[in-house]
Interface confidence: medium
């Protein structure tokens, strides 16, 4: 039934595939990069604009005419912290996730020329100005460099780096993909006199290889080898260096200085997982065990006279979890204040949600400064008087995002301002703080358009709009759009949240087909209140499908006993949670139950396919996109968080009791489409050329697609429509669906 | 099903106050606001404030600001107002209603309404 | 405070006829939500979020707008639809309402 009648009144069109595939309607976004405590940059029809945040006047910084002469297309830019220089991005090749190369000039703002002599070289890492001045340190062949001035040589600061075996100032695959979320290892002192490293050394790490196809022309498929250390495989080891970039010196090579892990780290396997400084001469760290339930955070300081740095045991602070992990994914970053003797931080309380507790270096306890049955998602920005932080804890909603501020001296005295600022159109707020807090951004993601907005925080005034989508309302007025529901049912006495794209002209008396739209992994969530458009509203609009998600066990958010429900156990209760939604969803009386369909990619490939092959009876078909098949071929650091280690000793049964495989005879009750690309150096197509393979030894009819050379995004252009339209095609036949 | 109750008519003196009772059932009560609402004799709607059974927060207008007061009982389910003060000027039917989160959200449930009529 | 203006006041069509209510607000809302209310019974959502038919409401209804200028449109009148109409709005406190367009039938 695909509610004709209300369709053929409505004379709008409905958003279609291709306006998907398209992006025929753009959200517009308003990204500004804060240059100080009251200006910042912002990026007009190629013109680097300067604003002033009080009055909203600006002036041309850069005229997008200046490098017109340059004979290279700018991929990005980044202006030195004193304005003098702008660091010019091209050449840029993407390695992985955050990962890539590029090129890299270097032009002179007061002479207005480029600088010409002792260049960076070409397929530079990484590349980060000082945080005052401008200093610059970058990464070149696993090896880290300093500039003191942009024109003068570098000074080297390591000897070491070797391709996938030594990194200095740049992290391995799995650091990169799992600790960091960044290419980046180098961390300089906030007065730019110090820079921090990791090095890390993959000799003994396995590596994965997969075939990369190239042109038609290359006869012989290239090998792709890449360190990736599967579950219970061997681990990177990593080392922590901080060197004096005051004391650089042309004749002798640069002394870096090691800071060591605590001993209670050395006796085993270890990460690093966070680095902040928390004065000139002060740094954090913190350590995480492989068995990822015990941290400990260093704060050393450095001891002029010796040139090393100190790190006390009585200033450690153990962080230790008992019924799961330790942070949402690692650790949380400690926000020092200004003298660096205290810091607040955001970690479990008694009853296992996530809030913000304030330490001081010399004591071990902490003391909480918000409480509840809500989490803090993130401290945004501290100053003498007050911190701001982000929270989920407005009207008791998981999904929504709000931004508040709490006295420094008087923890009771707390405020919301971004609540009732726009309480219909914005529920899910992100922040941008000037230099020093004077002025922040406000970006509101939904339930309605996306809003930029400017404020004072001084007085948290509103200052102006800076984006409104109007342009785009008015498009979006004359097409039949879905209308998104969150609420939540209730299974065992919990609180558990869904959302629902709605078809246009949604009637609960009439019969709908529901795709359950999965990810389900630890600490994800679905249900929220940001305004999309996506997949799902195509399916929704045009093919008047509900695109429904669920968080079930393991979500986030939502403290730990629903978060560490899944510890040492994937792909049990997370599973079964979304088959018990489908069935919810089944009974509200507008689902027709014959047509209930799921898809997931990555994690939400792997549900959708234990889903699957449960042989629950309730979902007719799915389609697992670059899915895990088995917690053995996936990355230690994610999967021991969750799993432990693959031993006897450990939790070796439940790895065996996870796959996908062990599934297959249950995929005869179910149609079943299974995509992956081929050079995915994430989620291995290893992972479904196993399933397809214990699918053909059980005589399961199934469908199939591989996406050649394709990584874990399917982002291409070309391959990122056909996997959509393909999909489409697939969910269509299988609702029997014109 | 998803449904406010609310208490009978109430007539009332001049000065006296009255306190007006909205009972919901069919859904979790402390999840959602509950709005109350004024239609004076044959005229149109005026909001007063929402409560948040989950924690108990209040918005009011500020026009009802020391005229009405907003409690819930999450025991029973029932959200109060209380209208303190009372003149000719507060005969109305008052209304409650659930604020529910679909998109930017609406009033989906209304209770039938108690008439308050203020008489000497 | 936003003030929401409804036209007109009152008004009768004959069945089959086309009828537009418009609410126009003092200053930009985000969305507009209708709702319909017959002599003594509560009010009765019909359109939430600017254009999305509130379950049970004929496809002969709709509703559209931006910015300050919003309205709903029955594309033929029949009977049952003789009722007031208000138009809310709730992008800035306090909430508000329109004051009500009556919609009689010929």
């Known amino acids: 039934n695909k509610g004709t009648d209300d369709a053929t009144a409505d004379s709008r069109k409905t958003y279609t595939l291709t306006d998907y595939l398209k992006n025929t309607y753009r959200l517009k976004l308003y990204s500004l990069r804060w240059i100080s405590d009251h200006e910042y940059l912002y990026k007009q029809e190629n013109n680097i604009l300067v604003f002033n945040a009080e009055y909203g006047n600006s002036s041309v910084f850069l005229e997008n005419s200046t490098f017109d002469e340059f004979g290279h297309s700018i991929n990005d830019y980044s202006i030195s912290p004193d304005g003098q220089f702008i660091l010019l991005e091209y050449n840029y090749v993407k390695q992985w996730r955050h990962s890539y190369t590029a090129s890299y000039d270097i032009y002179d703002l007061n002479k207005r020329q480029l600088i010409t002599e002792e260049r960076i070289p070409n397929n530079t890492q990484w590349v980060t100005w000082s945080p005052v001045g401008h200093k610059l340190a970058y990464v070149w062949n696993n090896d880290i460099y300093v500039k003191i001035e942009p024109n003068l040589p570098s000074y080297r600061i390591t000897w070491t780096g070797k391709e996938d075996i030594i990194y200095n100032g740049i992290t391995d695959w799995v650091y990169e993909e799992e600790v960091f979320s960044a290419y980046s290892a180098l961390w300089w002192s906030p007065n730019g006199t110090f820079l921090a490293y990791a090095q890390f050394n993959d000799t003994e790490v396995p590596l994965i290889e997969y075939s990369f196809y190239s042109d038609e022309s290359l006869q012989y498929p290239k090998t792709v080898r890449v360190p990736y250390p599967k579950a219970g495989a061997v681990n990177p080891t990593v080392k922590f260096f901080v060197v004096n970039t005051d004391s650089l010196s042309s004749v002798t090579n640069a002394t870096s200085i090691q800071i060591t892990a605590p001993a209670s780290m050395l006796i085993g396997d270890h990460y690093l997982c966070d680095v902040t400084w928390a004065t000139q001469e002060r740094i954090s760290l913190q350590w995480l065990r492989r068995i990822q339930n015990y941290s400990v955070m260093d704060i050393c300081d450095y001891d002029e006279s010796s040139g090393r740095w100190n790190c006390l045991v009585a200033r450690q602070h153990i962080e230790m979890s008992t019924t799961g992990w330790v942070g949402r994914f690692r650790p949380s970053e400690p926000h020092f204040t200004l003298d660096g003797n205290s810091f607040y931080k955001i970690i479990s309380n008694e009853e296992g949600y996530r809030h913000i507790c304030y330490f001081q270096i010399d004591k071990k306890d902490c003391t909480f400064i918000t409480k509840g049955t809500w989490e803090v998602i993130g401290i945004e920005a501290l100053t003498s008087d007050y911190l701001y932080y982000i929270s989920n804890e407005y009207k008791g909603m998981p999904g929504g995002r709000n931004l508040y501020k709490i006295q420094l001296s008087d923890y009771t005295k707390v405020t919301c301002l971004s609540c009732e600022l726009n309480p219909e159109r914005c529920q899910y707020y992100s922040v941008s703080f000037s230099k020093e807090a004077k002025y922040y951004q406000l970006r509101c993601s939904g339930p309605g358009l996306p809003l930029y907005t400017l404020h004072s925080s001084v007085n948290d005034k509103g200052l102006r709009v800076l984006e409104d989508n109007s342009a785009l309302d008015k498009m979006l007025q004359n097409v039949q759009m879905p209308s998104k529901k969150l609420d939540f049912i209730i299974l065992n006495e919990t609180k558990f949240w869904y959302q629902m794209i709605l078809p246009p002209h949604f009637d609960k008396s009439k019969k709908y087909p529901l795709l359950l739209d999965v990810y389900a992994g630890p600490c994800s969530q679905k249900a929220d209140t940001v305004f999309r458009l996506n997949w799902a509203t195509y399916l929704a609009s045009t093919e008047n499908i509900i695109v429904a998600s669920f968080d079930g066990r393991g979500s986030g958010y939502q403290g730990d006993k629903i978060m560490h429900a899944i510890n040492r156990r994937l792909g049990t209760f997370e599973v079964e949670d979304q088959i018990e939604a489908a069935r919810q969803f089944s009974k509200m009386g507008f689902v027709d139950n014959k047509r209930i369909a799921i898809w997931g990619w990555s994690y939400g490939g792997y549900v959708t396919s234990m889903v699957l092959g449960s042989g629950s009876g309730v979902f007719k078909c799915g389609i697992a996109v670059a899915p895990v098949s088995r917690w053995e071929y996936y990355d230690s650091v994610y999967t021991e968080r969750y799993m432990g280690l693959p031993t006897p000793e450990d939790n070796l049964d439940h790895y065996r009791n996870s796959t996908v495989m062990s599934r297959a005879e249950n995929f005869k009750q179910v149609e079943y489409l299974l995509i992956h690309g081929t050079a995915d150096d994430n989620v291995h197509f290893q992972q479904s050329a196993q399933i397809s393979k214990a699918l053909v030894d059980v005589g399961v009819d199934f469908q199939a697609m591989w996406y050649t050379d394709e990584d874990h995004g399917i982002a291409s252009s070309t391959a990122h429509q056909h996997i959509y339209t393909h999909m489409s095609h697939f969910i269509k036949q299988c609702f029997s669906l014109p | 099903e998803v449904q406010g109750v609310e208490s009978g008519a109430e007539l009332v003196k001049p000065g006296a106050s009255v306190k007006l009772s909205c009972k919901a059932s069919g859904y979790t009560f402390r999840s959602y606001d509950i709005n109350w609402v004024r239609q004076r004799p044959e005229q149109g709607l005026e909001w007063i404030g929402w409560i948040f059974p989950g924690d108990g927060s209040t918005k009011y207008n500020e026009k009802f600001k020391g005229k009405a007061t907003l409690t819930t009982d999450k025991s029973s389910s029932t959200a109060y107002m209380q209208l303190s003060r009372l003149t000719s000027e507060d005969s109305a039917v008052y209304f409650c209603a659930r604020w529910t989160v679909v998109g930017p959200g609406y009033f989906d449930v209304w209770g039938a309404g108690t008439t308050v009529t203020v008489s000497s | 405070q936003i003030v929401l203006t409804q036209s007109p006041a009152i008004m009768s069509a004959s069945p089959g006829e086309k009828v537009t209510i418009t609410c126009s607000a003092s200053s930009s809302v985000s969305y507009m939500n209708w709702f319909q209310q017959k002599p003594g019974t509560s009010p009765k959502l019909w359109i939430y979020?600017?254009?999305n038919l509130a379950s049970g409401v004929p496809a002969r209804f709709s509703g559209s707008g931006s910015g300050t200028s919003y309205s709903l449109t029955i594309s033929r009148m029949e009977a049952e639809d003789a009722a007031t109409y208000y138009c809310?709005?709730?992008?800035?406190?306090?909430?508000?309402f329109g004051g009500g367009t009556k919609l009689e039938i010929k």
């Open positions: 979020s600017t254009s």
């Open positions: 809310q709005q709730r992008s800035s406190y306090p909430n508000t």
